[in-house]
């Protein structure tokens, strides 16, 4: 996991999230997203 400190003084944690593709309409097994500060962006 990567951790970044911003000038505002708070830390944003980047964390890979794994989902089952069949839950989101695909059939490719497990897929990975990226959570930045609690929001999945990819």
């Amino acid at each position: 996991d990567a951790e970044f400190r911003h000038d505002s003084g708070y830390e944003v944690h980047h964390q890979k999230l794994v989902f089952f593709a069949e839950d989101v309409g695909s059939n490719k097994g497990a897929i990975i997203g990226l959570m930045v500060g609690g929001v999945v962006i990819a």
Epitope: K16, L17, V18, F19, F20, A21, E22, D23, V24, N27, G29, A30, G33, M35
Partner: nanobody, 123 residues
Framework: EVQLVESGGGLVQPGGSLRLSCAAS????????MGWFHQAPGKEREIVAA????????YYTVSVEGRFTISRDNAKNTVDLEMNSLKPEDTGIYYC????????????????WGQGTQVTVSS
Amino acid sequence: EVQLVESGGGLVQPGGSLRLSCAASGRTFSDYNMGWFHQAPGKEREIVAAISRSGRSTYYTVSVEGRFTISRDNAKNTVDLEMNSLKPEDTGIYYCAANSAGRAINLPLYKYWGQGTQVTVSS
């Protein structure tokens, strides 16, 4: 609500095998992705393996890939974890957990948890 009861833990020598089983009751088992988590002494709970609602998709953490196999039987409401080539670092409590569809499968944020079963790998 889903009730989960694990079994199959015990003491095994390095290189040995164990099969953990988790029996579910309550709500519709096939509505939930299922996961096995490992909690080593003094450490946080971490995902080991997960299986999708249908059983078609599986996920393994890198350290157990090729050694552990997760499977489920939706007719019997069970999910199993076959553990081979066990190592001392596999020691700890193993928890079965159920998670609603569409939620991240690698975080310990599952909705329902069993009480855990102890696995000790030691010579």
